[in-house]
Interface confidence: low
């Protein structure tokens, strides 16, 4: 049974040209996370697994920084880049869970920042 | 067995600087980050700062600038060169892979005082 929840830091908005961090954290549950994807649309940006450590997919290494935790901080940030992202939390025994944020990138200098953690 | 041992901490002033080390055995940090933790007085662990193979770091709002995070996988072994110590890095400093999440192993802790 899959009890666990996973919270993020939901709906944010950031400036052209800067940078955010996106966040997602499994709650609720004592399963042993195995991997995390992070996914843009149906595009793979990338991932942290429990051995190999993390993974960048090559059309977004030079835009895309590990961390902190197992978030992922977004640089460059162009107007393309607004839309979906989800976490994906592989875990064993439970399955998978699944975090949605949105993120829209504003031309304007006036972009609020959502509310982000950091994990741990 | 896994075992994190950590040491470098100490009695400092206002200021001061401190080196801390991490010593890994029975597993490898390589292919993962490594991070740095507190845990002050009364008050919940919270991240300082991550290494990642290949020398990518980052750091917690509170010692950007000050604190300086790097690695050694051939000696596994992780550093934390701590300079403008200010009272309020007063804290237990621990070493784990990060993210935690992944297999949260933890050592005893070293000890930092800053303090005139």
């Known amino acids: 049974m899959m009890t666990g929840t996973i919270e993020t830091t939901g709906n944010i908005s950031a400036e052209k040209g800067g940078s955010i961090i996106l966040q997602c954290h499994l709650s609720s549950t004592t399963a042993q996370v195995t991997q995390v994807n992070w996914e843009q649309q149906d595009q793979l940006l990338a991932i942290c697994n429990a051995d190999l450590g993390w993974h960048i997919s090559p059309s977004f290494k030079d835009r895309v920084a590990p961390g902190p935790g197992l978030g992922l901080t977004l640089q460059s940030l162009t107007v393309n880049d607004t839309g979906e992202y989800f976490c994906i939390y592989h875990t064993y025994p439970d399955g998978t869970y699944t975090g949605r944020i949105f993120l829209e990138v504003l031309e304007s200098s006036v972009a609020e920042h959502g509310a982000r953690f950091q994990i741990p | 067995e896994v075992q994190l041992v950590e040491s470098g901490g100490g009695l400092v002033q206002p200021g001061g600087s401190l080196r801390l080390s991490c010593a890994a055995s029975?597993?490898?940090?390589?292919?993962?980050?490594m991070g740095w933790f507190r845990q002050a007085p009364g008050k919940e662990r919270e991240w300082v700062a991550s290494?990642?193979?290949?020398?990518?770091?980052w750091y917690a709002d509170s010692v950007k600038g000050r604190f300086t995070i790097s690695a050694d996988n051939s000696k596994n072994t992780a550093y934390l060169q701590m300079n403008s110590l200010k009272p309020e890095d007063t804290a237990v400093y621990y070493c784990?892979?990060?993210?935690?999440?992944?297999?949260?192993?933890w050592g005893q802790g070293t000890l930092v005082t800053v303090s005139s």
């Open positions: 784990a892979r990060d993210p935690v999440e992944l297999g949260d192993y």
């Open positions: 029975g597993t490898t940090f390589s292919s993962a980050a």
């Open positions: 290494v990642l193979r290949g020398g990518y770091t």
